[in-house]
Every structure is written in C-alpha cells, then in structure tokens.
Amino acid sequence: HNTTVFQGVAGQSLQVSCPYDSMKHWGRRKAWCRQLGEKGPCQRVVSTHNLWLLSFLRRWNGSTAITDDTLGGTLTITLRNLQPHDAGLYQCQSLHGSEADTLRKVLVEVLADPLDHRDAGDLWFPGESESFEDAHVEHSISRSLLEGEIPFPPTS
C-alpha cells in the first residue's frame, strides 16, 4: 500500500476519504485505526455502526467521526479540532471476522493556522520542510507516496 498524505490546519476539521470497491467489501463494517510506527500495530480509533445497513450513520469517538457510503464505496473520517498530537500514520480498514483488510494508509500532517500568531513557531507552515522526498502532490490536502518510496517522517 502506498501512503496518502492528508494535511489539515490546527484547530480546524480534516476530512479523510478512503475509496474502496463496494462490491468486494459488500456487507463489511469499516474502521479507522492509528498505527504505532510504520511496522507497529494499528490501534482502533472508531468503527462504523454495528449494523452494516446503518453504516451511513456518523459515529463519533472523541473528536473523530466515521461514516460509510457503502453504495458509492467511500469511507469518510472526520478529525475535528485538529491538534499536533493527531499527526501520524493511520489506516482505513475493512473488517471481516477477526481480520482486517487495509483500504488505505494515511499520513495525517498538521499545519499551522495562519491566523493564529500565538503558537506560530509550534506548527508547520506549508512551504517549510517536507516530510516526504519527491512526493507527488495530488491536490491541496492530500498526496500519495511514489511507488517504492519510503515514507519519511519514526520517531519513534
């Protein structure tokens, strides 16, 4: 799996989308988990409704919400009031039994709020250092790593 980078502004909401094959994953619940290092375990943050037919209902865990368009094949995660500690590696998963298939690997980056001058030194402004070398920018909030590219950030 390539890793897609989603950038959000501190204090604002960030929407992460994970497209998937709706037929292949028919009847499966989905989940959003946080990975502890590139090779580490993925800790469940939030999952879709226990009843698959109600997957369209938004479910919250703290400031993270999940909703699933099972017909269109798009899982959407919302991170509300984004903070620096929300930065990290995540996965969108499709659940079947005790197993989980990775739909997308996501790196969340937190950018500085350009209107917030109080902590201007604490957060990254776009145009400063890049976490990824030669990363392809797809659009304003996400980019994918190139084939075979090592996702440079872990630390550990």
Epitope: G40, H85, F125, S129, F152, S156
Partner: antibody, heavy 120, light 107 residues
Framework: QVQLVQSGAEVKKPGASVKVSCKAS????????IHWVRQAPGQGLEWMGW????????KYAPKFQGRATITADTSTSTAYMELSSLRSEDTAVYYC?????????????WGQGTLVTVSS | DIQMTQSPSSLSASVGDRVTITCHAS??????LSWYQQKPGKAPKLLIY???NLHTGVPSRFSGSGSGTDFTLTISSLQPEDFATYYC?????????FGQGTKVEIK
C-alpha cells in the same frame, strides 16, 4: 526474553574493515527496523543507518554512505553492520537498535554495544 | 540534515529538584521527537516518544511537551537514579539526528 545481543569487542588497524553482528531473540527482526548508532568515547550518539530486514531496504546517513553496509539474515534473525576504510576516529561503541520505524513506534530495543578500537 | 540543539549541555541538581531540558530543531519536525536516557557504559533507554508519550515502564515524573521546533523534557522530582545523560532525537526525516546531550549531575 526480548533482547538484542551483539558480537564482542574488536581491535582493528587503520584501513581495515569491521563487521559487527546483532542477534535478536524473543522477536522476529522482520517485524522491526534495525538501526545502527555509534558513540565515540565521551561523545554523543550518532545515527549511522537502518535496514528493513523484511524488504532488504537500507538507508544511511550521508556521512557513512559508501563506507557502511547494513545487512540482515532473517533466517538467523541477525543484523550486521560492516564499516570499511577504518580510521582512528571510528573508535566508538556501536549499538544496534530495533523499533517499528517512524510515526510513533512504541517498541524500542537496544543491543549492549560493541566497542571497536581502531589503532595502529 | 536537521540539527538538534539541546540546552543546557550539563546541569547540577539535587534530589527532589524539578529539572527541565530543552531541545530545538533546526526545522519543523511536527511531534516526531523522542527522549532517551543513557547511563555510563549502558545503551540508551527510551523515555518519551512522539514528543509527549511516556514509554512503557517509565516513571510518571518524566514528561515531554512541544511540537514544531521546540521541545521540553521535564523531571518533576529528580531521583538518585535519574542522574544520567539525556538525548533528544528527531524522527521527522532521515537521517535521524540526536541532540548533543544534557548531562544531569549531582549538586
């Protein structure tokens, strides 16, 4: 018990090469990245490079590119670091270090260190 | 390479003191900073990962804070076993780089 056990101390002459081994027990090295870090006497820590034993990919600090070679043998769960063209300033304790990579690894294991002395 | 600068390079303190060590990164590293403790003749030990997360088994008197370029390691009440050298390390990009270390000595 989870641990990394390194090979013994080495004394080498300038211009020679040294190969230090690091054997993992209690875990599989394929599930980790193996880093090499060195520390000259009385000095700080210096990251040399890393290997992903599962993929065989390795990456080096620019200072060691071309002179250090990091390899791994998954069948014996052992990682190696070879440093060539040794000079006196390479005298240091060399540590291997295993973690789950970047982005918040919660796993962190270190070898006991191997003293390499370069002297004519 | 990203340069990591620690201050102070050494400090003298007494048991029970509150100790603060700072680490400055030459460029933005988000929260990808770890703190290590090293005692003479021993390998480093991870204390804090991701700037503020306490590693398993590390006493709660240790805490970390910061993001971006400025980070802090705090020992709320120094204990005899805490006299050691402390290093910060960035994990935003390779090569990973360490600060030069802060030696905490007995006053």
């Amino acid at each position: 018990q989870v641990q990394l056990v390194q090979s013994g101390a080495e004394v080498k002459k300038p211009g020679a090469s040294v190969k230090v081994s690091c054997k993992a027990s209690g875990f599989s090295i394929e599930d980790f990245y193996i880093h090499w870090v060195r520390q000259a006497p009385g000095q700080g820590l210096e990251w040399m490079g890393w290997i992903d034993p599962e993929q065989g990919d390795s990456k080096y600090a620019p200072k060691f590119q071309g002179r250090a070679t990091i390899t791994a043998d998954t069948s014996t769960s052992t990682a190696y670091m070879e440093l060539s063209s040794l000079r006196s300033e390479d005298t240091a304790v060399y540590y291997c270090h295993a973690d789950h990579g970047n982005y918040g690894s919660t796993m962190d294991y270190w070898g006991q260190g191997t003293l390499v002395t370069v002297s004519s | 390479d990203i340069q990591m600068t620690q201050s102070p390079s050494s400090l003298s303190a007494s048991v029970g003191d509150r100790v603060t060590i700072t680490c400055h990164a030459s460029q933005h590293i988000n929260v990808w900073l770890s703190w290590y403790q090293q005692k003479p003749g021993k390998a480093p030990k991870l204390l804090i990962y991701k700037a503020s997360n306490l590693h398993t088994g590390v006493p709660s008197r240790f805490s970390g804070s910061g993001s971006g370029t400025d980070f802090t390691l705090t020992i709320s009440s120094l204990q005899p076993e805490d006299f050691a050298t402390y290093y910060c390390q960035q994990g935003q990009t390779y090569p990973r780089t360490f600060g030069q270390g802060t030696k905490v000595e007995i006053k």
